[in-house]
């Protein structure tokens, strides 16, 4: 069974998938469509790296540009380094500027909805 066929079988169960499952799925060549991606739990999507989302969505990653104002895409973009976002070739803006340090202050982030940054 190839990645696409596997994805069709598990698609209906993905809504509540934790981050670890999504990370594992990103290694399976599933090419998840954007509509399914946007139904995932925001807290499960946020920790994914640009490389992992790129692998998870495959060719559909191109659609992130059109959905950059919608959750969880918007929130995910804010968590990524701008350098990494640039590799997607979509002109996405709003990532963490180069040279900034991301502090994993869970309480701060829970309250503000954005990561805490220390300038260069």
């Amino acid at each position: 069974m190839n990645g696409s066929e596997y994805f069709v079988k598990i698609q209906s169960f993905l809504g509540g998938a934790p981050t670890e499952d999504l990370k594992a799925l990103s290694q399976q060549n599933v090419s998840m469509d954007l509509a399914t991606f946007m139904k995932l739990r925001t807290d499960a999507v946020l920790p994914l790296t640009v490389a992992e989302v790129q692998k998870l969505l495959g060719p559909h990653v191109e659609g992130l540009k059109a959905e950059e104002r919608h959750r969880p895409v918007r929130d995910w973009i804010l968590r990524q380094r701008q350098d990494d976002l640039d590799t997607l070739g979509l002109g996405l803006q709003g990532g963490i500027p180069n040279g900034y340090l991301v502090l994993d202050l869970s309480m701060q982030e829970a309250l503000s909805g954005t990561p805490c940054l220390l300038g260069p």
């Epitope: 509509a35 139904k39 659609g63 540009k65 959750r71 070739g89």
Partner: antibody, heavy 115, light 113 residues
Framework: QVQLQQPGTELVTPGASVKLSCKAS????????MHWVKQRPGQGLEWIGN????????FYNEKFKNKATLTVDKSSSTAYMQLSSLTSEDSAVYYC????????WGQGTTLTVSS | DIVMTQSPSSLAVSVGQKVTMSCKSS????????????LAWYQQKPGQSPKLLVY???TKDSGVPDRFIGSGSGTDFTLTINSVQAEDLADYFC?????????FGGGTKLEIK
């Protein structure tokens, strides 16, 4: 203004390969993926695949996986599509088109495969 | 693969008339999270390359005349041309960009009487 420039025609013999070009101007080349589309008279439009000019990632329609190879040259803002083992079935107009919405298209290259 | 079916395959109308063409997809193109339908309409005039008219089923691209109206959701979509002009002579294609391979309808050829 946005422009995608393609050569008008290519004439090649069966069994040979050809590399079609698409020179982009008027926008940031690495901010939009490039798509390639085939059009044969009376057969509609077929999506061949796309390429991320930023990192060279490519994705193909399964039907064209062994036929087309997509590449880019960032320094010249040019996308390329190589077609191999050409037959008369490959005679068609080939378009490059910008981005997910295909909002700008090249004028197309008419490829004729004939001995 | 998602199959896109357009109808009619051709139609002939007089200048000033209203035209409606249909596009149906074999599965829903609606992203329920953003309420966007991943469907576009293109116009291809004789001897020219396709031109984007409408995206997300109903959003007109810049510079497209107001007489072109896209509508529909899910699997059923319509392109309406109010008061057809002579320059609207063209083939009209719908295309889904919900999932790869991205697929096009067979087209509707608009002829002017």
């Amino acid at each position: 203004q946005v422009q995608l420039q393609q050569p008008g025609t290519e004439l090649v013999t069966p069994g040979a390969s050809v590399k079609l070009s698409c020179k982009a101007s008027g926008y940031s080349f690495t901010s939009y993926w490039m798509h390639w589309v085939k059009q044969r008279p009376g057969q509609g439009l077929e999506w061949i695949g796309n390429i991320n000019p930023s990192n060279g990632d490519t994705f193909y329609n399964e039907k064209f996986k062994n036929k087309a190879t997509l590449t880019v040259d960032k320094s010249s803002s040019t996308a390329y599509m190589q077609l191999s083992s050409l037959t008369s079935e490959d005679s068609a107009v080939y378009y490059c088109a910008r981005g997910w919405l295909r909002d700008y298209w090249g004028q197309g290259t008419t490829l004729t495969v004939s001995s | 693969d998602i199959v896109m079916t357009q109808s009619p395959s051709s139609l002939a109308v007089s200048v000033g008339q209203k035209v409606t063409m249909s596009c149906k997809s074999s599965q829903s193109l609606l992203n329920s999270s953003s309420q966007k339908n991943y469907l576009a309409w293109y116009q291809q005039k004789p001897g020219q390359s396709p031109k984007l008219l409408v995206y997300f089923a109903s959003t007109k691209d810049s510079g497209v005349p107001d007489r072109f109206i896209g509508s529909g959701s899910g699997t059923d979509f319509t392109l309406t041309i109010n008061s057809v002009q002579a320059e609207d002579l063209a083939d009209y294609f719908c295309q889904q960009h919900y999932t790869t391979p991205y697929t096009f309808g067979g087209g509707t050829k608009l002829e002017i009487k």
